[in-house]
Interface confidence: medium
């Protein structure tokens, strides 16, 4: 271009459809200059105008020659320019914020603007820059980019921003600008100008001075508090911790808390202090609800479902901020809400859900929700498999007969389609418990009944019951215990009977033992004793319990004695015993020794003995009839241990083994014995029968059985020189070599001659008896031999 011709042609577009081209006028031209602008290769491509810019339709790709003729008073000048889209700048129109609003409760700004997309021919990406400024000094807080797309229509755009500082704390300004990133445009792209600024500020009321108020926040978050004050704020505390003040407009201040700690249930206090006042708020720092743990559902009665769960990690939020729970069943669409009043039991929460007719499968979702978030747990449950029956109530026991009872109880619920497995605990006094399992068909009316047999008559039982469904999920709790005495039955056996002749041989004394409770089958009231021979049967009068003995005058003929026990129901089978013994001439008295507590008796098997064996025992020193006690053992036995609390060590007892056939008893063995042998309690009495110059004849007596305290095994005779009333007197002093001892093992020997003695010498004699239980005390004597003649 020549100097003095139009120069510096530049073109811009704000919508890609129209280019706005402008140039600088030739130097020296005044106002009245006209221009002719011609665009090469265009029909009607010349334009007359009076200003230095022209709007032309956007040119398609390629180079275009633009001729500008300037017509003015001094003549004309022409300039030629080459114009290409690449030389054009795309500068969007300045955007305008249509609306800026705020939600002060959430400290959120809401922005609304129009993209004026209808003026653009193509879809284009748009980048928006949004600038947030704070305080009167317009400090930049946030610069964000936001992407949208132009779609040929005017589109309203919304954008929101949550402020880290409550919006009440300071004025907030917002500006926007845009950049159109059109793929169809090859020229330079530039940012629009910033929009006119919009602002949001809070109109203070007289009450609230500190923001935010009663905020619920996630533990570990950062949060800003501020105090709107006319007076100077001196300090700020969160809990007991001082915080540095951040100055805002006027006297307003803020504090920033980083990584906030969990609050107590009453929240955490935030306090601002001025000279005259204290202003504050409460913050609740907690957690969103944890996923409900161990959600499980069961039913007690097939009418109502009980769902239990553990809330998991505590949220630290209570009251209106606590977690609320909703249990939704997805097949039916029904739901129930957890009421906060229903405080958790042992850390576990529970909800009841009414069962639905004909629905067995339930798909439960438990939703947990609090101000910080929500979570959920799901469970699919076949409720017929998850029955946890109530504790059986109204548990009753009724007699059927003496060995069977009827148990009845109440188990609330409609169990018509289900079977129960019930466990009955049967406890007899002083014995171990028995458990019986019974399967029972479930009913609609909650009343159940079962018969229990194989019990003992006249026995105190304690019953209790628990139930589960037969598929078993959980046992119910045990019912209350019920104590019950079964009814009496006739005694199952006759009494254990024995007989002895009186010492004068004229009377037969019949003894019997009380029946054990499991054979008595009731309270024994009396006994009937009868005696029969081939000719006659004679009955004694009824003998009331607890008398267990009767005496009958009998001759020595053979009689059968019968003893019958009676209770309120009836009589036992008779116990029979013959009055006379079956003779046995081939008997020797044997010695037996026990084992401290009892005595073991053994014998050879005898096939002739068909009823039983009887072992009878008595104290040897007692007068006739000899009977302390007896024991019956079965006929196939060949040994028994006899034990009794009456047995004493060192006491001699007589033991008799009888064998029985046809109710008659034959004495098979006669024994004397001790449970335990002791040493004799006395020494034998002895005397000197004869003395010579070189010998002494000593004679002694038997020790009585009571003092012997064991089987006599021998005597120890000690002798040595010794005089009465001297220190050399003690024969048994140890270390004396001149003392002689004679062990006499022939217990029938009652005399002893001591020879080879010295004449006219004093001798000390000592005699002791011994058993297997030890050596008895000593008896001593001093004897002087005669003088040698």
């Amino acid at each position: 271009q020549k100097k003095g011709a139009p120069h510096d042609l530049k073109c811009v577009t704000n919508n890609l459809q129209v280019w706005d081209c402008y140039w600088k006028a030739p130097s020296g031209t005044g106002r009245g200059t006209d221009y002719e602008v011609c665009i090469e290769n265009r029909s009607h491509s010349c334009y007359q105008l009076e200003k230095t810019n022209i709007k032309i339709p956007a040119l398609s790709h390629g180079d275009y020659e633009i001729t500008i003729n300037s017509l003015h008073d001094f003549g004309s000048s022409t300039s030629k320019f080459t114009l290409n889209e690449q030389n054009v700048s795309l500068i969007p129109d300045t955007p305008e914020i249509l609306n800026l609003s705020a939600d002060f409760s959430t400290s959120t700004l809401y922005l609304k603007w129009n993209d004026r997309g209808s003026v653009f021919p193509h879809h284009s990406n748009v980048i928006w820059e949004i600038k947030i400024l704070r305080k009167e000094s317009m400090e930049l807080v946030k610069l964000v980019t936001h992407n949208t797309t132009l779609n040929g229509k005017d589109t309203l755009h919304h954008w929101s921003w949550a402020s880290d500082m409550p919006l009440e704390c300071a004025i907030h300004f917002v500006e926007i600008r845009c950049y159109i990133d059109s793929l169809h445009f090859s020229g330079r792209k530039e940012w629009s100008d910033w929009s006119p600024v919009k602002n949001i500020s809070w109109m203070p009321d007289s009450q609230t001075k500190v923001f935010p108020q009663d905020k619920v926040i996630l533990v570990g978050s950062d949060i800003t508090f501020c105090c709107i004050s006319q007076e100077k704020v001196l300090s700020a505390l969160i809990g007991h911790t001082n915080c540095p003040l951040i100055h805002l407009d006027g006297e307003n201040v803020a504090i920033k808390i980083h990584n906030i700690s969990v609050s107590a249930s009453s929240g955490t206090n935030v306090v601002f202090t001025t000279e005259d006042n204290i202003f504050g708020t409460v913050i609740f720092a907690g957690y969103p609800p944890d996923t409900p743990q161990q959600l499980n559902c069961e039913t007690h009665d097939l009418k109502e479902i009980l769902c239990r769960w553990n809330p998991g990690r505590a949220t630290a939020l209570v009251g209106p901020r606590a977690t609320s729970y909703t249990l939704l069943e997805s097949f039916s669409g029904k739901y129930v809400r957890f009421k906060r009043a229903e405080a958790p039991t042992n850390g576990s929460y529970q909800l009841f859900f009414q069962m639905l007719p004909n629905q067995e499968i339930y798909n439960f979702t438990l939703n947990a929700h609090n101000p910080l978030g929500r979570s959920e747990s799901t469970i699919l449950v076949n409720i017929t498999e998850k029955v946890y029956p109530h504790t059986p109530t109204s548990f009753k026991v009724k007699d059927i007969n003496s060995t069977a009872v009827k148990l009845s109880w109440h188990l609330p619920g409609n169990f018509a389609k289900i079977n129960f497995l019930c466990q009955i605990e049967i406890k007899k006094s002083n014995t171990v418990q028995e458990q019986r399992n019974v399967t029972i068909k479930g009913v609609e009316n909650s009343s159940y009944l079962v018969a229990l047999d194989k019990l003992n008559p006249y026995t105190v039982y304690t019953f209790r019951i628990r139930c589960s469904t037969e598929t078993f999920w959980k046992w119910s709790k045990w019912s209350n215990k019920k104590q019950h005495l079964t009814t009496e039955a006739i005694p199952s056996k006759g009494p254990d009977t024995w007989r002895e002749w009186s010492s004068d041989g004229k009377n037969l004394i019949i003894y019997w033992k009380p029946l054990p409770i499991n054979e008595a089958n009731g309270k024994i009231l009396s006994y009937n004793v009868s005696c029969s021979s081939d000719e006659e049967t004679q009955s004694l009068s009824e003998i009331p319990d607890p008398q267990h003995k009767a005496e009958i005058q009998l001759d020595k003929n053979d009689y059968i004695i019968s003893v019958v026990a009676k209770n309120s129901v009836g009589s036992s089978p008779p116990s029979k015993i013959a009055s006379m013994e079956i003779p046995n001439d081939d008997l020797k008295i044997e010695q037996v020794v026990g084992m401290g507590k009892g005595i073991l008796l053994t014998w050879h098997y005898d096939p002739n003995m068909t009823c039983d064996y009887v072992i009878k025992w008595c104290n040897s020193s007692r007068s006739e009839p000899c009977l302390m006690d007896w024991r019956k053992v079965p006929s196939n036995s060949t040994e028994t241990v006899i034990e009794s609390d009456q047995f004493r060590p060192g006491v001699r007892y007589n033991f008799f083994l009888y064998g029985c056939r046809n109710q008659g008893y034959q004495l098979l063995r006669s024994m004397i014995g001790y449970i335990e042998e002791l040493a004799p309690t006395v020494a034998p009495n002895f005397t000197v029968e004869d003395t010579s110059a070189d010998s002494i004849l000593v004679k002694w007596e038997d020790i009585p059985v009571e003092e012997l305290r064991g089987f006599l095994r021998g005597y120890l005779f000690y002798f040595g020189k010794g005089e009465r009333d001297t220190s050399k007197m003690r024969v048994l002093e140890s270390g004396r070599s001149d003392i002689k001892v004679k062990n006499i093992t022939d217990i029938s020997q009652k005399t002893l001659r001591i020879a080879d003695l010295q004449g006219k010498t004093s001798y000390h004699l000592v005699l002791r008896a011994y058993t297997d239980g030890g050596v008895g005390p000593e008896k001593s004597m001093y004897v002087v031999t005669k003088e040698n003649s």
């Epitope: 996923t291 409900p292 743990q293 161990q294 959600l295 499980n296 067995e360 747990s377 799901t378 469970i379 699919l380 076949n382 017929t384 498999e385 998850k386 289900i418 079977n419 497995l421 037969e470 598929t471 078993f472 999920w473």
Partner: antibody, heavy 116, light 110 residues
Framework: QVQLVESGGGVVQPGRSLRLSCVAS????????MNWVRQAPGKGLDWVTV????????YYADSVKGRFTISRDNSKNTLYLQMNSLRAEDTAMYYC?????????WGQGTLVTVSS | DIQMTQSPSTLSASVGDRVTITCRAS??????LAWYQQKPGKAPKLLIY???SLESGVPSRFSGSGSGTEFSFTISSLQPDDFATYYC????????????FGGGTKVEIK
Amino acid sequence: QVQLVESGGGVVQPGRSLRLSCVASGFTFSSYGMNWVRQAPGKGLDWVTVIWFDGSNKYYADSVKGRFTISRDNSKNTLYLQMNSLRAEDTAMYYCARGERTLDLWGQGTLVTVSS
Amino acid sequence: DIQMTQSPSTLSASVGDRVTITCRASQSISSWLAWYQQKPGKAPKLLIYKASSLESGVPSRFSGSGSGTEFSFTISSLQPDDFATYYCQQYKSFSPGGLTFGGGTKVEIK
């Protein structure tokens, strides 16, 4: 998605021990009873053991009683089977399966071979 | 222990056939019975529970019936995807023997 994944199988000598794991995902593990079921090569299914949702009840087949122990860690969504004193007849594919009784979700199984 | 006897052990059939498998319990198990399908190399899949209830997502051609000790499982019209082994399982009680499965029935192509 809802699934069970077993691991821990392998070849082991008779008398030795092995521990199987089963990791659950996609459902609330702590709300369900869990089983181990095994299948010897070419044979049918053989139930081994079950544990209640909260670990309160455990039941075992007679053939493994006293040797195998089932346990669970609800915080890790994991079921375990501790197998001691292993025998040749314990050789099988071991599956973990969800449910106290009806087994509505099964893992792909882990193979245990007991051989000297 | 409750024993489960399944019959037949193998069954040959053609696509479109109606197929029935039976399962007998050694003592009454009410309706506590499930049926499973297992394909080679795969885990079993629950089809029927409580003797006759169809598991969610299982085609209606599968059905079950019976109670007490006698149970049957029917595929009304056999499809190519149904060739597999089928097991019954009682779940009445864990005590003394626990859950028990039948020996299985292999349904193969005739």
